[in-house]
């Protein structure tokens, strides 16, 4: 009974990372409200005048949107009534990094939460046996990383061994002059062993595993975003 805006509602955000040149999502949820027309979602970015995005009365209102976000943002409109205020961001750029605020107003009240959005580049590594080398070696390649990551090798058999003396890592700038291709070669590998190539920067950690036996080669890779 006329309490709109007087109560605080819970708004939850999640620190996330964006891969430059791809779609990103700024995650935000709130207490659901079945009255769509009464929901206002505002996304703001620290240091930017104007809004990143605004959704109200059941539709987008871009009248106050900052130019750097024009044509690059959208909420998941069909999920707003169930409490999803997340923002889809097109063509993530390095300059999109920063502190964002998700502000919500509903018939139940209002609330807001901040999130740190990191931007960079990260990709899955692929390990192959390099038969061109004079001795058997492994080649670990990942097409896009930024900032420059660290690369380390590990082995199941020689746990704790330092492979820096028997590996060579190079970083090749990609055509857009921001991201880099990572190539690391591990020499003198032995058969019937599992090797791991680990690539890490402050945004993501990726691991590629390869098991080489007399009869087959098994590969596996995984990518994990770091929320620190």
């Amino acid at each position: 009974f006329g309490i709109s805006g007087k109560h605080f509602i819970t708004v939850t955000t999640f620190t996330s990372a964006g891969n430059i040149g791809e779609d990103g999502t700024l995650s935000c949820t709130f207490e659901p409200d079945i009255k769509l027309n009464g929901i206002v979602i505002q996304w703001l970015k620290e240091g930017i005048k104007g809004l990143v995005h605004e959704f109200k009365e059941g539709k987008d209102d871009l009248s106050q949107q900052h130019e750097m976000f024009r044509g690059r943002t959208a909420v998941f409109a069909d999920q707003v009534v169930v409490g999803n205020a997340s923002l889809r961001l097109k063509n993530v750029q390095l300059t999109d990094a920063g502190t964002y605020t998700c502000y919500i107003r509903t018939s139940k009240g209002k609330g807001n939460a901040n999130l740190e959005y990191k931007t960079g580049a990260f990709s899955m590594p692929e390990i192959n046996v390099d038969y061109n080398a004079s001795s058997e070696s492994l080649r670990c390649e990942a097409p896009r990383w930024f900032p420059q990551p660290t690369v380390a090798w590990a082995s199941q058999v020689d746990q704790g061994a330092n492979f820096s003396e028997v590996s060579n890592t190079s970083f090749e700038l990609n055509s857009e002059n921001v991201t880099m291709k990572v190539v690391s070669v591990l020499y003198n590998v032995t058969i019937n062993n599992t090797y791991s190539c680990m690539i890490e920067n402050d945004i993501a950690k990726a691991t590629g595993d390869i098991k080489v036996t007399d009869s087959e080669v098994k590969r596996r890779s995984q990518l994990q975003l770091l929320n620190s």
Partner: antibody, heavy 121, light 107 residues
Framework: EVQLVQSGAEVKKPGASVKVSCKAS????????IGWVRQAPGQGLEWIGD????????NYNEKFKGRVTITRDTSTSTAYLELSSLRSEDTAVYYC??????????????WGQGTLVTVSS | DIQMTQSPSSLSASVGDRVTITCKAS??????VAWYQQKPGKAPKLLIY???TLQPGVPSRFSGSGSGRDYTLTISSLQPEDFATYYC?????????FGQGTKVEIK
């Protein structure tokens, strides 16, 4: 069902202007960008520009800047392309298309039937 | 502005053939590449967007791939209705750009 219905064929003299309309139905007109593309006889597709009907924001291909104006009328859910100082090279089929992704400018997923504009003295 | 260089400009193929069309962006990296099919006298039809996402209703014999500056449309087994002209579109930047087109003809 998304539908874009364009105005009929036009014949214009060099130096004149033409205004092509594109009436949208089957979705919320103000929530999606609308783009314009042209195709000269026997040639490829050429992006002209687009508009966000919800705010009237526009983007234009540099090649057409100064000669092209894209507008909209939200009361009739209609987008317009106006091209001035026409020359024979502007003879083409002009298409309007809705951009996928709502306020996010996506790829063109629904197209009008095309409007043939002929420029001839 | 980003230009899209499409190749080949035309190709002849038979029903059942595997067909590959490529587009090379003049600069930068983003995944915002779409592919269209156009038949004479008709408006273009969206096949694939965001490099590899198939538009609903498009047969699975069409696939897209690519990264960096190089993007590919593949038709795994050409059907009679696939003879048409294909265009790539770069839509990641403020200014959109089409490739020059590839006409797929019957051998």
């Amino acid at each position: 069902e998304v539908q874009l219905v364009q105005s009929g064929a036009e014949v214009k003299k060099p130096g004149a202007s033409v205004k092509v309309s594109c009436k949208a139905s089957g979705y919320t007109f103000t929530s999606y960008w609308i783009g314009w593309v042209r195709q000269a006889p026997g040639q490829g597709l050429e992006w002209i520009g687009d508009i966000y009907p919800g705010g009237g924001y526009t983007n234009y291909n540099e090649k057409f800047k100064g000669r092209v104006t894209i507008t909209r009328d939200t009361s009739t859910s209609t987008a317009y392309l106006e091209l001035s100082s026409l020359r024979s090279e502007d003879t083409a089929v002009y298409y309007c298309a809705r951009l996928d992704g709502s306020s996010y400018r996506g790829a063109m997923d629904s197209w009008g039937q095309g409007t043939l504009v002929t420029v001839s003295s | 502005d980003i230009q899209m260089t499409q190749s080949p400009s035309s190709l002849s193929a038979s029903v059942g053939d595997r067909v590959t069309i490529t587009c090379k962006a003049s600069q930068g990296f983003n995944k915002y590449v779409a592919w269209y099919q156009q038949k004479p006298g008709k408006a273009p039809k969206l096949l694939i967007y965001y490099t590899s996402t198939l538009q609903p209703g498009v047969p699975s014999r069409f696939s897209g791939s690519g990264s960096g500056r190089d993007y590919t449309l593949t038709i795994s087994s050409l059907q009679p209705e696939d003879f048409a002209t294909y265009y790539c579109l770069q839509y990641g930047n403020l200014l959109y750009a089409f490739g020059q087109g590839t006409k797929v003809e019957i051998k």
